[in-house]
Interface confidence: medium
């Protein structure tokens, strides 16, 4: 992927809108939308003010760990859906899109240098462990996906892209 493709706001917005569509389609859906187990996902809460003052390398650690856990969670959701007796087609479509979207975002972040940033900060070893929550429905899973993209990921890419411009 081109190194700074994710710095084009339209790219992230595309994934954000996909995530929100998925969230919207599962609103009020009970019958087909239970995960039937608790899946661990990243806690998307962001202390905006603390985040803003964080070193970009520390931000990269949080984003990289969160993205990895979220990708695992969505893949687990996809597996559960495949194994269910009658997967709901619109849900299947959005889960598949989320899997594909997270793979693409991982590639785009790697191209931006997030992985290197996440390894190199001097205080990376002492970083607080990633906070997690659980999701028991696809609605919650998609809500976390949507929140993660427009929370930590958007804040991180905004800062990393600005830093790269200097």
């Amino acid at each position: 992927a081109p190194p700074r493709l994710i710095c084009d706001s339209r790219v992230l917005e595309r994934y954000l809108l996909e995530a929100k569509e998925a969230e919207n389609i599962t609103t009020g859906c009970a019958e087909h939308c239970s995960l039937n187990e608790n899946i661990t996902v990243p806690d998307t809460k962001v202390n905006f003010y603390a985040w803003k003052r964080m070193e970009v390398g520390q931000q990269a650690v949080e984003v990289w760990q969160g993205l990895a856990l979220l990708s695992e969670a969505v893949l687990r959701g996809q597996a559960l859906l495949v194994n269910s007796s009658q997967p709901w087609e619109p849900l299947q479509l959005h889960v598949d899109k989320a899997v594909s979207g997270l793979r693409s975002l991982t590639t785009l972040l790697r191209a931006l240098g997030a992985q290197k940033e996440a390894i190199s900060p001097p205080d990376a070893a002492s970083a607080a462990p990633l906070r997690t929550i659980t999701a028991d429905t696809f609605r919650k899973l998609f809500r976390v996906y949507s929140n993660f993209l427009r929370g930590k990921l958007k804040l991180y890419t905004g800062e990393a892209c600005r830093t790269g411009d200097r």
Epitope: L12, E13, L16, L17, K20, T44, K45, V46, N47, F48, Y49, A50, K52, R53, N147, R150, G151, K152, K154, L155, G158
Partner: antibody, heavy 127, light 107 residues
């Protein structure tokens, strides 16, 4: 229950400095989990966020682009309050001025939601 | 700078559903808040994070946000809901942006 009590003059002459204070009860101005804002409202400009201060091991502030060159927001820890100073005012700055508290730490939106407001102070800029 | 656009007024009969819209470029990718303001009073937060209600706000108030439009929905409207409603979003690093406000009239 957080309460915000505003004080300051209701009339300021053009080119002078507008000064308002917001006294906090039920929370601390130097809390690590809150942020303290000034917002104004006028018929011509509607609601307009002016700036924020917050304490995270040290003091930080952010100001709206529209007033950045003229605004200062300061904490007063001894009195548990914070103040607004707006320099070189013009009649355009005539508005109801509110102080408000926002709480960082929710999903990335709640931190900007202004959950507690002062009652507002009408400030008229006129000679 | 970012602009949020609201209709100046919305009218609704008591017991019916009122919908107030707020539009902005790709607004669905930002979080939206809604404030209720009655004459002579400070605004009151009724919705944050697009659709979450602070404690004390009735369930009749709900919100959604997708594409370019956020919507505040008030079901079973009561006379006491008559007020000005403002949407707001933190659409950039430092500036919180408010919409121009919508006057809700209960017929």
């Amino acid at each position: 229950q957080v309460q915000l009590q505003q004080s300051g003059p209701g009339l300021v002459k053009p080119s002078q400095t507008l000064s308002l204070t917001c006294a906090i009860s039920g929370d601390s101005v130097s809390s690590n989990t809150a942020a303290w804002n000034w917002i104004r409202q006028s018929p011509s400009r509607g609601l307009e966020w002016l700036g924020v201060i917050y304490y995270r091991s040290k003091w930080y502030n952010d100001y709206a682009v529209s007033v950045k060159s003229r605004i200062t927001i300061n904490p007063d820890t001894s009195k548990n309050q914070f103040s607004l100073q707006l320099n070189s005012v013009t009649p355009e700055d005539t508005a109801v001025y509110y102080c408000a508290r926002s709480v960082p730490g929710g999903d990335p939106g709640l931190e900007h939601a202004f959950a507690y407001w002062g009652r507002g102070t009408l400030v008229t800029v006129s000679s | 700078s970012y602009v949020l656009t609201q209709p100046p007024s919305v009218s609704v009969a008591p017991g019916k559903t009122a919908r107030i819209t707020c539009s902005g470029d790709n607004l669905g990718t930002y979080y939206v808040e809604w404030y209720q303001q009655k004459p002579g009073q400070a605004p009151v937060l009724v919705i944050y994070d697009d659709s979450d209600r602070p404690s004390g706000i009735p369930e009749r108030f709900s919100g959604s946000n997708s594409g370019n439009t956020a919507t505040l929905t008030i079901s079973r409207v009561e006379a006491g809901d008559e007020a000005d409603y403002y949407c707001a979003s933190f659409a950039s690093w430092s500036d919180s942006v408010f919409g121009g406000g919508t006057k809700l009239t209960v017929l």
